[in-house]
């Protein structure tokens, strides 16, 4: 038993032209988190089993808001390690997938929106208990820098975490044939229970008397390196120990195809035929199945109909993308008619309608004048979804029920006096002014700035405002 540990050092734009846009903005702040999936390298079950060695999800990083105009920098990362505990022996060779996810932090009723920024994959050979291994992987324009290691959990030790350590029985030294357990010098290796002669480097056992081989090794004592080329290969000298012809250098030697892929030589290089669920030049990219939980935001995972499509995510309303990772801005399609306000609730879309409109998309124009009478001879006018009365002279208010005081607004200029009249208002102008609203001055010589007053009206007479 032990723990695989992954430390993310940086995630940001890779070198070269075409730097990616920052994934966050002032309008949509976001934060990153990471997911790691581990599978044993060449084991037969790897193609089918979901993250058979284990998987882990990081905490979420600090909230990041893009500085306008600035290039995308290395993005702030979550604290701590990603730890994937493993119960059995460490396989020595493993496949990994590391995904970088963005969580948008808008005001989302249906929960945060996730989107996959980058996915890197690879296959590595790693002994447990060794130092941190550093790695750089690129996905599109992004670059991920990370370190990883596998360490055994006491009492297990060794490159596969299969040897056991026990506290010393005597204070001075370990028993006959037993070494101290580095780095736990105060403990001793437990007596070996594996089959006699089982390679301590390449074999391990979980039951007394057995000898199980780590990946890449075979034979009853796990001392024979696995070679995928035939023993009858015409190249190379004969091997005295195995009776086989040891192959000379060839493109398929050592089988460059990961995850159980089969290698065939081509005139210039080699070609890997990958098992279902794996792809890439060396079958190094692991296929994801429904059991890995690839659908986000409540999407339903269904097995793909053809071998090239391991799964399909059916997304809930409001999400899209191959993993349901993208929130659909359904309001950007302006589904609400007649000026209605669009609300995306995550699980549903709602329209808040303006007065006078109704329906799921505010598509129904209510007949505001239906059943509404305008009093005192007023007429009902529909407009903008609101009911309005055009009132007869001398009346006002929403329903023309109020008797209008035409003088309330002080319509007579230059000190003219206002009189209410059955047909409107009349202004009695102060000396020197004339006009319906007393707006025009009378010239001192008696000539008006206007054409001559109509017959029967002298300047200064009250004038009816029609």
């Amino acid at each position: 038993a032990g723990v695989f540990e992954l430390q993310i050092h940086s995630f940001g734009p890779g070198p070269g032209p075409g730097a990616p846009r920052s994934p966050c903005s002032a309008r949509l702040p976001c934060r990153l988190f990471f997911r790691v999936c581990l599978k044993p390298g060449l084991s037969e079950e790897a193609a089918e089993s979901p993250c058979a060695l284990g998987a882990a999800l990081s905490a979420r990083g600090p909230v990041y808001t893009e500085q306008p105009g600035a290039p995308a920098p290395d993005l702030p990362l979550p604290d701590g390690l990603l730890q994937v505990p493993f119960r059995d022996a460490w396989p020595g060779t493993f496949s990994f997938i590391i995904e970088t996810w963005r969580e948008e932090l808008g005001d989302q009723i249906g929960g945060p929106a996730w989107s996959l920024l980058a996915r890197v994959a690879g296959r590595r050979r790693l002994a447990a208990g060794g130092p941190w291994a550093r790695d750089i992987q690129r996905a599109g324009a992004w670059e991920l820098r990370f370190s990883y290691r596998a360490r055994c959990e006491p009492p297990a030790v060794g490159t596969a975490c299969t040897r056991l350590c026990r506290p010393r029985s005597a204070p001075s030294r370990c028993g006959p044939g037993l070494r101290p357990c580095a780095p736990l010098e105060d403990e001793c290796e437990a007596p070996l229970v594996c089959r006699a002669g089982c390679s301590p480097e390449h074999g391990f056992c979980e039951q007394p008397g057995e000898c199980r081989c780590l990946e890449g090794w075979t034979g009853p004592l796990c001392t024979v390196p696995v070679s995928t080329s035939s023993c009858l290969s015409p190249r190379g000298p004969s091997s005295a120990t195995t009776g086989c012809l040891v192959p000379g250098p060839g493109p398929c030697d050592g089988n460059p195809c990961a995850n159980g892929g089969s290698c065939s030589e081509t005139p210039r290089s080699f070609e890997c035929t990958c098992p279902r669920g794996f792809y890439g030049l060396r079958c190094e990219v692991s296929g994801v199945t429904c059991a890995d939980g690839p659908c986000f935001n409540g999407g339903l995972c269904v097995g793909g109909a053809d071998p090239d499509s391991a799964y399909i995510c059916h997304c809930p309303p409001g999400f899209q993308g191959s993993n349901c990772e993208k929130r659909v801005d359904r309001c950007s399609l302006q589904p609400c008619r007649n000026g209605g306000l669009c609300l995306d609730l995550g699980h549903a879309l709602r329209c808040r309608c303006r007065a006078g409109f109704a329906g799921p998309r505010c598509e129904h124009d209510l007949d505001d004048c239906a059943g509404r009478a305008c009093a005192n001879g007023g007429t009902c006018v529909e407009g903008g979804g609101a009911h309005r009365c055009s009132c007869a002279l001398g009346f006002g208010g929403r329903d023309c029920r109020e008797r209008a005081d035409p003088c309330a607004a002080r319509p007579c200029a230059h000190g003219g006096r206002c009189y209410a009249h059955f047909s409107g208002l009349v202004c009695a102008c102060a000396p020197g002014y004339m006009g319906a609203r007393c707006e025009f001055p009378v010239h001192p010589d008696g000539a008006s700035a206007l054409p001559a007053a109509p017959p029967g009206l002298r300047p200064g007479d009250p004038q009816r405002y029609l």
Epitope: P50, A55, L57, A291, G293, G298, G299, C301, P316, P317
Partner: antibody, heavy 119, light 107 residues
Framework: EVNLEESGGGLVQPGGSMKLSCVAS????????MQWVRQSPEKGLEWVAQ??????????HYAESVKGRFTISRDDSKSSVYLQLNNLRAEDTGTYYC??????????WGQGTLVTVSA | DIVMTQSQKFMSTTIGDRVSITCKAS??????VAWYQQKPGQSPNLLLY???NRFTGVPDRFTGSGSGTDFTLTITNMQSEDLADYFC?????????FGGGTKLEIK
């Protein structure tokens, strides 16, 4: 193969408590929403509670009839989901199913565990 | 809450028949409806999701249709192994709600 196994049911008096457990295997448990659904002859199938992922801060949702009395939780390291039932009533009687949850239908169900609330 | 109503509690059928089970939602749920089959003494199994999509391994004699408030599960060429209870469920909004179920029986 996906497998869900419930346990913890039994007979309990009104006002009593119990804790249901569900152990999952055959899938990456920590990446899935999980839910409890119950079934009784009187009420048929009834959704009870849902718990989302660590990255959602384990957000939980409940049916109105159990809010404040039932608590859903999960332990990803043990591939397990739990339902703590408090202040039980006669109408809580039924078979409680653990389901591999999501929003678009419940893909996999356990065999169920029977909870009987009776004096 | 959205109420899902399966008006027919029982339906009689014969092998080889075409059977249609209906479900009505109390408000518009779009196409966010799933159907489950439950055989005696077993747990429910997901048949259809998003109204008409068959889940993995479901035979193509099961089809679904409808949108808004009215939904139908149709079994063409009824088989003896299809004798079971059938439930509809909406996932348009919390709380997630099920119909009361329709039991298929042999005439």
């Amino acid at each position: 193969e996906v497998n869900l196994e419930e346990s913890g049911g039994g007979l309990v008096q009104p006002g009593g408590s119990m804790k249901l457990s569900c152990v999952a295997s055959g899938f990456a448990f920590s990446n899935f929403w999980m839910q409890w659904v119950r079934q009784s002859p009187e009420k048929g199938l009834e959704w009870v509670a849902q718990i989302r992922l660590k990255s959602d801060n384990y957000a939980a949702h409940y049916a109105e009839s159990v809010k404040g009395r039932f608590t859903i939780s999960r332990d990803d390291s043990k591939s397990s989901v739990y339902l703590q039932l408090n202040n039980l009533r006669a109408e809580d009687t039924g078979t409680y199913y653990c389901t591999q949850g999501n929003w678009v239908g419940f893909a996999y169900w356990g065999q169920g565990t029977l909870v009987t609330v009776s004096a | 809450d959205i109420v899902m109503t399966q008006s027919q509690k029982f339906m009689s059928t014969t092998i080889g028949d075409r059977v249609s089970i209906t479900c009505k939602a109390s408000q518009n749920v779009g196409t966010t409806v799933a159907w489950y089959q439950q055989k005696p003494g077993q747990s429910p199994n997901l048949l259809l999701y998003s109204t008409s999509n068959r889940f993995t391994g479901v035979p193509d004699r099961f089809t679904g249709s409808g949108s808004g408030t009215d939904f139908t599960l149709t079994i063409t060429n009824m088989q003896s192994e299809d004798l079971a209870d059938y439930f509809c469920q909406q996932y348009n909004n919390y709380p997630l709600t099920f119909g009361g179920g329709t039991k298929l029986e042999i005439k």
